[in-house]
C-alpha cells in the first residue's frame, strides 16, 4: 500500500526541513559563542545532569507518553524528537534574544540549553492536543510559533511587571495547555465512520505510554528545580515535587479504580494521572514550606486528574468539538490553574506570615501574569490553527488521523497493524 | 547571626599561590552561594567568582579564570580562594560574602539579591 | 560582561540634603542590581536589592529606582553616618561587576 502522505509534501518536506536548519546554523554561527565563565569540571557535571534529565523527560517522557494510539506510536515518538530538536534550536536563539537589550552575541550556558529544553517541552505538551492529525510540516510551523510566542509573553512579562525573564517560565504549563487545545479546536474536527479503530488504545501502546509517564515521574523534580539558582528554592522544589508525585501515584491507582463500576484500574487514567502531583506543584514548588502541603496537594491534584480524566475528554468533545486529545493533555490545563492557585494563596501567607503591607499588590500582579499568560496562549493558538489549516500544508484527512502508514515506510505490513 | 572571617598569609611573592578560607558560622554554607571580592588599596571593588554551596558549581571573572580556583568543604562549612602566579597588582584586602535570597522571589540563572554578609576582609600584600 | 558606571564620582553634601546617585549599565540588567555602603576600612554593607528592595536593617531614608540600563540611589534626608562611599553592583549575568563607586563627602 502506497504512503497517502501526499507527494507534493513528500517532496518539499525534506527540503524545507534542511532549509531551516541551514538557517539557523547560519544565525548560531553569527549570533551565538559559549560562556567563558563556567569553569569547575565537578559543576560543569552536576549542571549537565540536570539538563540531561530534562532531555530525557522531553525525549523518552513525553515521546512515550503520546505514543498510545495503536496506529500512531512511531510518528508519537519520533515526531516528539524532532520537535525537540527543533525547538531547543529555536529557542536558544529566542531566548538569547529576547533577554538583552541592546541584542548583542548569545552566550550559550549549560543554563540557556536547560532554558531552551523547557521552552521547546512546552511545545511536546502541546502537540499532545494534535499529535495524529497533523503532519510533520504543519508541526514544525507550530514548533516556531509556539516557542516565539512563549518567549514573547515571558518578555512582555518580564516588561510590564518588572520581574525576571527566566521566572515567567513558570506559567509554562498553562501556557502550553491552552495553547495545544486551542490548535486542536481550530484542526477539522468530524471524523468519519470507520477511522474510531485508528484511534482505539491497545495494551503495547498503553504500556509505552505508561513507560513515558514513568520517565516524567522519576524526573519531574528535575523540571520543577531545574532553572532555580537559589539552593534553598532548589532543595525545596525537588523535595516539594517528589512529595506531590508519590501521593498523586497512590490517588491515580485506588482513584481511577473507586470511578469504575467494577473497580478496575484504567491504565489510561494512571499514566496520566501519577505526574498530577508534578504539574500541580510546579509553579510554587520553590514556595511550599512543608512537606504534608507538597503532599495535599499531590492528593488533590490526582483527585482532580481522575475526575478530569472521565469528563473533560466528553466535554472537550461535546462542548468544544475538540476530538480525540489526549487525557494527559487535558489535565494540564486543569492542574497547570491548580498550581497557579495556589502560588497565589502561598504568596498571601507568606506575605501575611512576613507581615508585608503588599499582598493586594502581589495578588494583583500574579492574576496579571496568569491572564497575560492564559490570553496570549489563546491569541497565538488561534493564529497557530488558522495557520495550520492553509491548504499548502496538505494536512492529512481525517480519514487518515492516527495512521502511522501516511508517514512511514514499514519493512512489511502485517495484518492488524 | 551569620559571621563570615577570612584567615590566610598577609604577605606573598610574585609567583607564589595564594590560599585564602573563609569560616562561615551562624548557616550552612549549602544553603547559599558564595562569592569573593577583592578591593586594591584606593580603588574599587572586583568581583573575583563564586560557588554554589550544594553543588560544585563555580564562575569566575574572565579576566582571572586562568588562575583562581573557588572550592568549599561542606563539613567544615568553610570556603577556599586559591590564586596562582601572583603579582603585585593582586595586592587587595580580600573579602568573602553571602548571597542573598528572598523565600517569595526565586533567583535563576546569575541573578541574585546582592551579598548580604560580607567577613571583614584580609588584607594581602604581592611584595619581592 | 555588563559595565557599569557611577556619577557622580564624588559629591559633597550636608546634613538633611537630598542626595542622588546615578548608575548606567553596558546593557539592560532587568531589576538586578544592588547598592553597597563602604565606610574607610571596613567591609560593604547591602542597602538595596533587586534596585528597589531595602534591605532589612537599613533605614527608609535610603531608596533605590530604575529598572534595564539606568538606576537611581536616593537618600532623602542625609544623616552624618552616611558620608562613604557607595558602590552598584549589577547581578543580571556573570561576571558580576561594580561601578566604580561615589563617595559622598561633607561639604
Known amino acids: 500500500m502506497s504512503s497517502k502522505y501526499p507527494r507534493s509534501v513528500r517532496r518539499c518536506l525534506p527540503l524545507c526541513a534542511l532549509t531551516l536548519e541551514a538557517a539557523l546554523i547560519l544565525l548560531f554561527y553569527f549570533f551565538t559563542h559559549y560562556d567563558a565563565s563556567l569553569e569547575d569540571q565537578k559543576g560543569l557535571v552536576a549542571s549537565y545532569q540536570v539538563g540531561q534529565d530534562l532531555t530525557v523527560m522531553a525525549a523518552l517522557g513525553l515521546g512515550f507518553l503520546t505514543s498510545n494510539f495503536r496506529r500512531h506510536s512511531w510518528s508519537s515518538v519520533a515526531f516528539n524528537l524532532f520537535m525537540l530538536a527543533l525547538g531547543v534550536q529555536w529557542a536558544i536563539l529566542l531566548d538569547g534574544f529576547l533577554s538583552q537589550f541592546p541584542p548583542g552575541k548569545v552566550v550559550i550556558t549549560l543554563f540557556s540549553i536547560r532554558l531552551a529544553t523547557m521552552s521547546a517541552m512546552s511545545v511536546l505538551i502541546s502537540a499532545g492536543a494534535v499529535l495524529g492529525k497533523v503532519n510533520l510540516a504543519q508541526l514544525v510551523v507550530m514548533v516556531l510559533v509556539e516557542v516565539t510566542a512563549l518567549g514573547t509573553l515571558r518578555m512582555v512579562i518580564s516588561n510590564i511587571f518588572n520581574t525576571d525573564y527566566h521566572m515567567n517560565l513558570r506559567h509554562f504549563y498553562v501556557f502550553a495547555a491552552y495553547f495545544g487545545l486551542t490548535v486542536a479546536w481550530c484542526l477539522p474536527k468530524p471524523l468519519p465512520k470507520g477511522t474510531e479503530d485508528n484511534d482505539q488504545r491497545a495494551t503495547i501502546p498503553s504500556l509505552s505510554a505508561m513507560l513515558g509517564a514513568l520517565f516524567l515521574w522519576m524526573f519531574w523534580p528535575s523540571v520543577n528545580s531545574a532553572l532555580l539558582r537559589s539552593p534553598i528554592q532548589r532543595k525545596n522544589a525537588m523535595f516539594n515535587t517528589y512529595y506531590a508525585l508519590a501521593v498523586s501515584v497512590v490517588t491515580a491507582i485506588s482513584g481511577s479504580s473507586l470511578a469504575h463500576p467494577q473497580r478496575k484500574i484504567s491504565m489510561t487514567y494512571v499514566h496520566s494521572a501519577v505526574l498530577a502531583g508534578g504539574v500541580a506543584v510546579g509553579t510554587s514548588c520553590h514556595l511550599i514550606p512543608s512537606p504534608w502541603l507538597a503532599m495535599v496537594l499531590g492528593l488533590v491534584a490526582g483527585l482532580i486528574s481522575i475526575g478530569g480524566a472521565k469528563c473533560l475528554p466528553v466535554c472537550c468533545n461535546r462542548v468544544l468539538g475538540i476530538h480525540h486529545i489526549s487525557v494527559m493533555h487535558s489535565i494540564f490545563s486543569l492542574l497547570g490553574l491548580l498550581g497557579e492557585i495556589t502560588y497565589i494563596v502561598l504568596l498571601v501567607l507568606h506575605t501575611v506570615w512576613n507581615g508585608n503591607g503588599m499582598i493586594g499588590f502581589q495578588v494583583l500582579l500574579s492574576i496579571g501574569e496568569l491572564s497575560l499568560a492564559i490570553v496570549i496562549a489563546l491569541t497565538s493558538g488561534l493564529l497557530t490553527g488558522l495557520l495550520l489549516n492553509l491548504k499548502i500544508w496538505k494536512a492529512p484527512h481525517v480519514a487518515k488521523y492516527f495512521d502511522d502508514q501516511v508517514f512511514w515506510k514499514f519493512p512489511h505490513l502485517a495484518v492488524g497493524f | 547571626e551569620v559571621q563570615l572571617l577570612e584567615s590566610g598569609p598577609g604577605l606573598l611573592k610574585p609567583s607564589e599561590t595564594l590560599s585564602l578560607t573563609c569560616a562561615v558560622s551562624g548557616a550552612p554554607i549549602s544553603n547559599y552561594w558564595w562569592s569573593w571580592i577583592r578591593q586594591s588599596p584606593g580603588k574599587g571593588l572586583e568581583w573575583i567568582g563564586e560557588?554554589?554551596?550544594?553543588?560544585?558549581?563555580?564562575y569566575y571573572n574572565p579576566s582571572l579564570k586562568s588562575r583562581v580556583a573557588i572550592s568549599k568543604d561542606t563539613s567544615k562549612n568553610r570556603l577556599s580562594l586559591k590564586l596562582t602566579s601572583v603579582t603585585a597588582a593582586d595586592t587587595a584586602v580580600y573579602y568573602c560574602a553571602r548571597e542573598g535570597q528572598n523565600p517569595l522571589v526565586p533567583t535563576y540563572g546569575s541573578t541574585g539579591f546582592g551579598l548580604d554578609f560580607w567577613g571583614h576582609g584580609l588584607a594581602v600584600t604581592v611584595s619581592s | 560582561a555588563a559595565e557599569l558606571t557611577q556619577s557622580p564620582s564624588s559629591l559633597s553634601a550636608s546634613v538633611g540634603d537630598r542626595v542622588t546617585i546615578t548608575c548606567q549599565a553596558s546593557q539592560g540588567i532587568s531589576s538586578w542590581l544592588a547598592w553597597y555602603q563602604q565606610k574607610p576600612g571596613k567591609a560593604p554593607k547591602l542597602l538595596i536589592y533587586?534596585?528597589?528592595s531595602l534591605q532589612s536593617g537599613v533605614p527608609s531614608r535610603f531608596s533605590g529606582s530604575g529598572s534595564g540600563t539606568d538606576f537611581t540611589l536616593t537618600i532623602s534626608s542625609l544623616q552624618s553616618e552616611d558620608f562613604a562611599t557607595y558602590y552598584c553592583?549589577?547581578?543580571?549575568?556573570?561576571?558580576?561587576?561594580f561601578g566604580q563607586g561615589t563617595k559622598v563627602e561633607i561639604k
Open positions: 560557588i554554589d554551596g550544594s553543588i560544585y558549581t563555580t
Open positions: 553592583q549589577q547581578y543580571s549575568s556573570s561576571p558580576r561587576t
Open positions: 533587586k534596585a528597589s
